[in-house]
Interface confidence: low
Amino acid sequence: DSSKWVFEHPETLYAWEGACVWIPCTYRALDGDLESFILFHNPEYNKNTSKFDGTRLYESTKDGKVPSEQKRVQFLGDKNKNCTLSIHPVHLNDSGQLGLRMESKTEKWMERIHLNVSERPFPPHIQLPPEIQESQEVTLTCLLNFSCYGYPIQLQWLLEGVPMRQAAVTSTSLTIKSVFTRSELKFSPQWSHHGKIVTCQLQDADGKFLSNDTVQLNVKHTPKLEIKVTPSDAIVREGDSVTMTCEVSSSNPEYTTVSWLKDGTSLKKQNTFTLNLREVTKDQSGKYCCQVSNDVGPGRSEEVFLQVQYAPEPSTVQILHSPAVEGSQVEFLCMSLANPLPTNYTWYHNGKEMQGRTEEKVHIPKILPWHAGTYSCVAENILGTGQRGPGAELDVQYPPKKVTTVIQNPMPIREGDTVTLSCNYNSSNPSVTRYEWKPHGAWEEPSLGVLKIQNVGWDNTTIACAACNSWCSWASPVALNVQYAPRDVRVRKIKPLSEIHSGNSVSLQCDFSSSHPKEVQFFWEKNGRLLGKESQLNFDSISPEDAGSYSCWVNNSIGQTASKAWTLEVLYAPRRLRVSMSPGDQVMEGKSATLTCESDANPPVSHYTWFDWNNQSLPYHSQKLRLEPVKVQHSGAYWCQGTNSVGKGRSPLSTLTVYYSPETIGRR
């Protein structure tokens, strides 16, 4: 109630002779600050004096007097909250009641605290969980109701007297609620820890033994078993007997049932500690163990691998991989159930023994077509030889072999013929499914592997074919050797390099681009007349009469080819000039007379000049000289001159006679 002072501290504190006591304490006075504090040992209230009697361990007064005991006993509090005390060292006769006499200005209070000091260090207390199971982590707790700042201690865990290697966590409490030192150890006990002694040892700061507590571990665990087999190596032959014995080396709690397992499956009607197998068969090979159960669960022994030996069973062959591609590697594996494992193998290819092959695997690094066929094997161990199984088939695949392109036509082939070719091969696996031809053309393939070329061209040189299955194999190209008449025949002027002038030396060449066969003949022709049979046509001194249209022909055994007509043009100065007169060389005066300068020239005359009988040039320059009206005095001899780019030519004199008209004569 509100008339009391309020104190908080542990009810009882524990220590031993020579140690110390630390008393955590708090208070709240009724009014004002603390003015006086006395610590009594076993205080008694004296009704006569209305005061407390007893040993004064500590005294704090206004005048500040302190008894000599104050060095051992210390008040660590203050005037309004803290009443913590320390006694160091503490003695056996300090056991009893401590009385804290507190006085403020107007109020007084006596607070009692119990102190229990033993002669020797008291033991800690080990706390265990209610049940411990193997491999399940548990926490072991060691508790000591003591802690004091002036007296360090340590708690150590021991298993069968040996320090435990697991790390313990130590904690201390010095509070108004509790004073203790505690060590906690996390630990996963194994079945082998069952019945072992665990100790918590109290030691001083130097590791000196002070006291301890011990407990015996009760570790619940499944039965622990040992299995024994006769014969000891568990290797027998068919028809032999085997005995297996199961021994329980530890079980907590006691075991309840026994059973035997083979390859993880329980064997029926086998519920004793001995398993007798009489006249074993190879099917009884396997892993055996015994299983014994208790309330925790089943325990299993190690497995015994019982091996019933027998001669190899009929073998099978596994091929990696079939079909195989030529040139690849292939591995054959002989598989035969046997115990002991086969030590020797015999291999057969198409029924014939393969020499030098005695391993379970046969490796062929580079497969060839002849490797195809049936492979079988026989396995052998110390108990006998197995039978040959059905074998496995190796299919070796390869591109078509020895592919050739064959011309079916009679030779030679001529331009325009129809040519038939076939694509042949020696062998193929898988079968040929298609053919390819080079070069590509608009050709017919009337049947698989046959090519028809209609109207073969002169320039069809070579053809190659490929036969294809999963791969294509190309044949070497075959030459068609098409024969044809000479091609591109033309006339070419070799000399002169410029225009041909009359009198020049001239050479014409008959050219062609190609001919098959190469042996040819030449023919020159002008206006349907044969001129020569050489490749060249030569003129030592060309004349205008040689001009004209020339052709050359080139002949081989297939045919002949003519060039386009080639025009030979000869340039020459005007020649054969003459003056012609119209209407005649005798004209009546007053009429019209026309003189024409006729000539032969190449190129044509470009310029004319007229002359009279006095060789006087006349002011006329056209081909015709027109006199109108003609006069008697025009009578006389005339000539003309023609000019072209090559030169000049002149005509002979031609006489014009102009006679008088009847009128003129009549006037005379």
């Epitope: 190596d233 290797i235 892993k287 190690e302 497995e303 691998f305 091996q307 030996q309 594996l333 002989c334 598989m335 115990n339 002991p340 494992l341 030590t343 391993e359 379970e360 695997k361 161990n381 110390i382």
Partner: nanobody, 126 residues
């Protein structure tokens, strides 16, 4: 003299892979069935896998089936154990052992074998 020397062990994270090798010398390797045995700390020997003389037959403990592959190279006189999808419970010292019996032999007892290696430590931990 006869020697079996294991190598390839080490620290690996769970789910990781390692390949152990066992180099043989001083005896005719190809005549011997070869076995891997392991021992976790504080536990007994545990049979892991066995391979026949030619390498065609092999056998595995249930705990490693589908994760471990045993193989041998008679030309190189070497035994291998390829370990994948490793688990913390695979942590152990791995030994290779050989015997002259011509059959698949499963045992974790040391005296059942003709020759025994010194072991290589495999630790599976994150």
């Amino acid at each position: 003299q006869v020697q079996l020397v294991e190598s390839g062990g080490g620290l690996v994270q769970p789910g990781g892979s390692l390949t152990l090798s066992c180099a043989a010398s001083g005896f005719d390797f190809s005549f011997y069935t070869m076995t891997w045995v392991r021992q976790a700390q504080g536990k007994g020997l545990e049979w892991v896998s066995t391979i026949s003389t030619g390498g065609g037959g092999s056998n595995y403990a249930d705990s490693v089936k589908g994760r471990f592959t045993i193989s041998r190279d008679n030309a190189k006189k070497t035994l291998y154990l390829q370990m994948t999808s490793l688990k913390p419970e695979d942590t152990a010292v791995y030994y290779c052992a050989s015997h002259r019996r011509g059959y698949m032999f499963v045992s974790s007892r040391k005296n059942e074998y003709d020759y025994w290696g010194r072991g290589t430590q495999v630790t599976v931990s994150s």
